[in-house]
Every structure is written in C-alpha cells, then in structure tokens.
Interface confidence: low
C-alpha cells in the first residue's frame, strides 16, 4: 500500500493585511479515515487553526468541498489577514482514534504578512530655537511588515543626512515600527520652510508616505533694531523711529522708555508678512525739547517671543545747538546702544 | 437566523413540468452543497439530486434526464426542474443543506407538496 | 448504490427508557452516517452526523456510535417529545441513500 503523502507544495507565501491568504495542502490518500486539521507552529504549543472535520472556525473556509469523499485538496483560505496572523503553518493528517492519532504532517509554508506602514508622524522641538541652531525633528511610522523599509527626510526637497533611524524590534516579529531623528541647522529663511519624512515600503507599489513639519513651528528669528532719528521740527519736536524687522514669530512688544520711565507700551499685530515669511514693524516717538532741562534718555525695548528684552538707547541733549539735526541711525541691533541727539531751543 | 423555504409545488398531470424554488436567507447558498431530499406519502426519506459549490451536480437514477437541479447565486435560491412527471413522483420535496465540514445535512426547509395525477 | 439498512422498523417503548437503533451498510463508509429525527407532518430534523457528531441544539440524550458498515443510535433517557420516526443515512458517495427508518412509539 502506497504511503500517505501529504503535500504542502509552497514553502512560504507573503500576503498583503487586510487580503485573504490561501495555504495549499493535498494528501495522496484518504485512507486511512480521520480527519485534516491545520495548525500554526509545531510541537505542543502548537495552535489549532482549522478542523475540516468539526468546530467553529470564522475567518477559515475550505479551497475545495472537503465534503466531497473522492476530494484530496485539505486547501484552506484565510480571510482578513492581520500581522497577528504570520508564523508557520502545517497541515496534518490524522487517523481517527481517541484521542485522534498524528499520522503524517506537512512540510509547512511560512505565511509572512505585508502590512502597510501608518502615515509618518513628524514631530519638532518642544521650544523654538534661532537661526544657526541645530534642531531635532522626529519621524515615526508603525505596523508594518516584512521589515525592509527606507526613511528619508528632505528639507526644501534637498534630502538631509544628519539622520539617524532605528527599526524595532531588532528580532523577528509579525510587525515592526520605525523611528528617526533629523537634525535640521536653522537659517533666518527658514521661515516658510518644510521638513518631509518619507517612508518606502514593499506594500506602497512605489508611492511613499509622507509626513511633514513646518519650520516655522520650531524657528524664531530675532528682530533687527534700528532707531532713526528725523529732523527737528520747527516746533523744538523730534521724532524718533524705532524699526524692528526680519522678526518671526509675530508675537511682539515694544516699550519706549523716557529717562527709565515708560512712556508707552505697544503689541505687534496684524503685521503684514515679509516674502520671507518674516514681519517688520515701526513705531514712532514724538520727544518735545523744548519741554526738558536736561538731557532726555530714550530707550526703545523690544521682548520678543517671550525672550530677553532687546533695548536701544540715546540721549537728547538739551543745549544751544542748531535747530536741524541731520538723521542719526543707531546701527546696533542688541544691548545698549546710545546716540546724543542735540536739541537747541532758540 | 439560517432558512430554507421551498415553493413551487402542486398538482401536475403526468408528463407535466414543474419548477421548485428554495430561498435560502442566513447563508451565502453558494458555499455549500446544496440537495433535494423528497418523502411519498407514508414512505421514507429519498435523496433526489445535489450541487456542489462548483457547480458539479449529481442525481439519483430514477431522476436522471428528467430533473435538473441548478441555483441562481444572486437570488440565494435553489431549484429543481421537474420534467415528464410521473405519479412515483408524488412527494414532499425538501430543499436541504449540506453541512461545511463533510457534506452531512444540517438544515431542511419545510417541504412542498408535489401530486402527478390525471 | 449503498443501502442502509435500519432495525427495527418499529419500537414500543416507555418514557424514560433507554433505546437503542441500528444501522448497516451494505459496504464500508468510513464514518459517514447520520441520524434523523422525523415527526408527523414535519421536515426532519439532523441529529448526528459522521457517526457520533450532534449538530448544534441537539440534546446530549442522543449519541452515535459505530464506523465502517455498522452504527447505532442512543437516546438515554426518552421523553414524550422523542416519538417520532427515525432515519439513518449514508454519505460516502452519491447517489446518498437512507435506511426504511424506524417508528419509535408510546408503549
């Protein structure tokens, strides 16, 4: 009497999450009777997975009628295949006893599971940094399957290489999850600029995912100050301009101070926008002369994102000079900076 | 909940043609193989005629080239055409399905009366 | 063709008796038998199958035994409920074929 084969003719199949997968077995006989079962690993811990015979198997359904007594085809389909669902599968032949007695097992077929990678999560620093610091951007991505992915990360299109990616876990698993780190160096323009993670996978046919991050989440440029002085007028009034620009975020406040006392406080908004994405903003002080005895010590403060305060200060002498002042620019653009403004009254 | 209900029978002339119909609602008819089993008056249980989930059909001999059995996926429903009725044909006729695992049947419809006589 | 063939054809008994039917195949079907349970004026009802098999909601009263050509059906315990016709079935290979049933009575 010929011995009982049975065929498991593939050694692995690979099918997309979400697909059904189809996992072949034939025997060479029916006799002896007993019945096919399938099960997912090898030993005692082996998992039942479908019984042609009896049971309750939902997401199992037989290939061929395996009610049909001259059928040798035990073919299984499983629909809906999770991750969860990869591992080794064997079908086996049993002879009908009590308990059911193991006659002849399959080779197996690996049944490995494609599943997609979730949309990439791009995440920047929790606190805004200047130009010419170096910020870290982080890119994740989970759920996939087989393991073999590429991150890329790009900057304004031009691909970044100060990454550094890891995929978990390091062993075997039924999926996996990517996480990278991008350094990104600021520039003022970076304004309007973007940070891509984009994530190839066997299951994309081609079309990476993306996930991205706008710089001006993470960037501040510190403003530029400049203080001008206009010529006096012929009513012994000087106007002083304060001009704050190349500034991002919006978020602004400028405070003139008289002598160390405030004079007036004012807030940024509704700035139009620089192509840069930067703002600018210009604030005038009117300093009557002829009302001082003394010298007048004008200070223009500007706190910006919560920052230190940023001040240019000048003095105005009151004394005997020319009534017209040509045009005095305080050129600095942090710390102190003090300009004499001479004002005559006669 | 699973349901097979028969209808189409009545009384027929020998010779005469009949066409049963079985809905089946709770199952997908065309995963399982499917039977018509019938019962004369006062006899016992006889099996009639089979198809299986590919199509593949089978008939007792006395049936043979007389009955046809085919179903219509879309409607969920079986059928058996019954030409050049005889009187030995006069039964209850019960649409049957055949379990998943071997074929063994496990629901029956109600039955429908079917009478040849002149 | 198989045929079945079912013994006896009529059996008296009492409520909360123990019964036993039979069935024998002309030739080998493995474990290919099933039992039905039929009432006047009703469809049958499956009760078992693959020789010792209940289908869902049968009453665990019944059981099968047997393989090859010979098998039987048990009801341990009968109840007024339980009298009715009984028929086994082979379903090896077509043509399936059915034993000349069994009438269960009221003694």
């Known amino acids: 009497e010929e011995e009982l084969q049975v065929i498991q003719p593939e050694k692995s199949v690979s099918v997309a999450a979400g697909d059904s997968a189809t996992l072949n077995c034939t025997v060479s006989s029916l006799i002896p009777v007993g019945p096919i079962q399938w099960f997912r690993g090898a030993g005692p811990g082996r998992e039942l997975i479908y019984n042609l015979k009896e049971g309750h198997f939902p997401r199992v359904t037989a290939v061929s009628d395996p009610t049909k007594r001259n059928n040798m085809d035990f073919s299984i389909r499983i629909s809906n295949i999770t991750p969860a669902d990869a591992g080794t599968y064997y079908c086996v032949k049993f002879r009908k006893g009590s308990p059911d007695v193991e006659l002849k097992s399959g080779a197996g077929t690996e049944l490995s599971v494609r599943a997609k990678p979730s949309a990439p999560v791009v995440s920047g620093p929790a606190v805004r940094a200047t130009a010419e610091h170096t910020v870290s951007f982080t890119c994740e991505s989970h759920g996939f399957s087989p393991r073999d992915i590429t991150l890329k990360w790009f900057k304004n299109g031009n691909e970044l290489s100060d990454v550094q990616t890891n995929v978990d876990p390091a062993g075997k698993s039924v999926s996996y999850s990517i996480r990278s780190t991008a350094r990104v160096l600021l520039t003022r323009r970076d304004v309007h600029s973007q940070v891509i993670c984009e994530v190839a996978h066997v299951t994309l046919q081609g079309d990476p995912l993306r996930g991205t991050a706008n710089l001006s989440e993470a960037i501040r440029v510190p403003p530029f100050l400049e203080v001008t002085q206009q010529s006096m007028r012929a009513d012994n009034q000087v106007n002083v301009t304060c001009q704050v620009t190349k500034f991002y975020p919006q978020r602004l406040q400028l405070t003139w101070l008289e002598n160390g006392n405030v004079s007036r406080t004012e807030m940024a908004s509704a700035l139009p926008e620089n192509k840069d994405g930067t703002y600018n903003w210009t604030s005038w002080l009117l300093v009557n002369v002829s009302a001082h005895r003394d010298d007048v010590k004008l200070t223009c403060q500007v706190e910006h994102d919560g920052q230190p305060a940023v001040n240019k200060s000048f003095s105005v002498k009151v004394s005997a000079h020319p009534k017209e002042q040509g045009s005095n620019t305080a050129a600095e653009n942090t710390g102190t900076n003090e300009r004499n403004i001479y004002g005559g009254s006669g | 909940e699973v349901q097979l209900v028969e209808s189409g029978g009545g009384l027929v002339q020998p010779g005469g043609s009949l066409r049963l119909s079985c809905a089946a609602s709770?199952?997908?008819?065309?995963?399982?193989?499917m039977h018509w089993v019938r019962q004369a008056p006062g006899k016992g249980l006889e099996w009639v005629s089979a198809i299986g989930t590919a199509g593949d059909t089978y008939y007792t001999g006395s049936v043979k080239g007389r009955f046809t059995i085919s179903r219509e996926n879309a409607k969920n429903s079986l059928y058996l055409q019954m030409n050049s009725l005889r009187a030995e044909d006069t039964a209850v006729y019960y649409c049957?399905?055949?379990?998943?695992?071997?074929?063994?049947?496990?629901?029956w419809g109600q039955g429908t009366m079917v009478t040849v006589s002149s | 063709d198989i045929q079945m063939t079912q013994s006896p054809s009529s059996l008296s008994a009492s409520v909360g008796d123990r019964v036993t039917i039979t069935c024998r195949a002309s030739q080998g079907i493995n474990n290919y038998a099933a039992w039905f349970q039929q009432k006047p004026g009703k469809a049958p009802k499956s009760l078992i199958y693959t020789a010792s098999s209940l289908h869902s909601g049968v009453p665990s009263k019944f059981s099968g035994s047997g393989s090859g050509t010979d098998f039987t059906l048990t009801i341990s315990s009968l109840q007024p409920e339980d009298f009715a016709t009984y028929y086994c079935?082979?379903?090896?290979?077509?043509?399936?074929?059915f034993g000349q049933g069994t009438k269960l009575e009221i003694k």
């Open positions: 709770g199952f997908t008819l065309s995963s399982y193989d």
């Open positions: 049957v399905r055949g379990g998943v695992w071997d074929d063994a049947f496990d629901i």
């Open positions: 079935q082979q379903y090896v290979s077509y043509p399936y074929t």
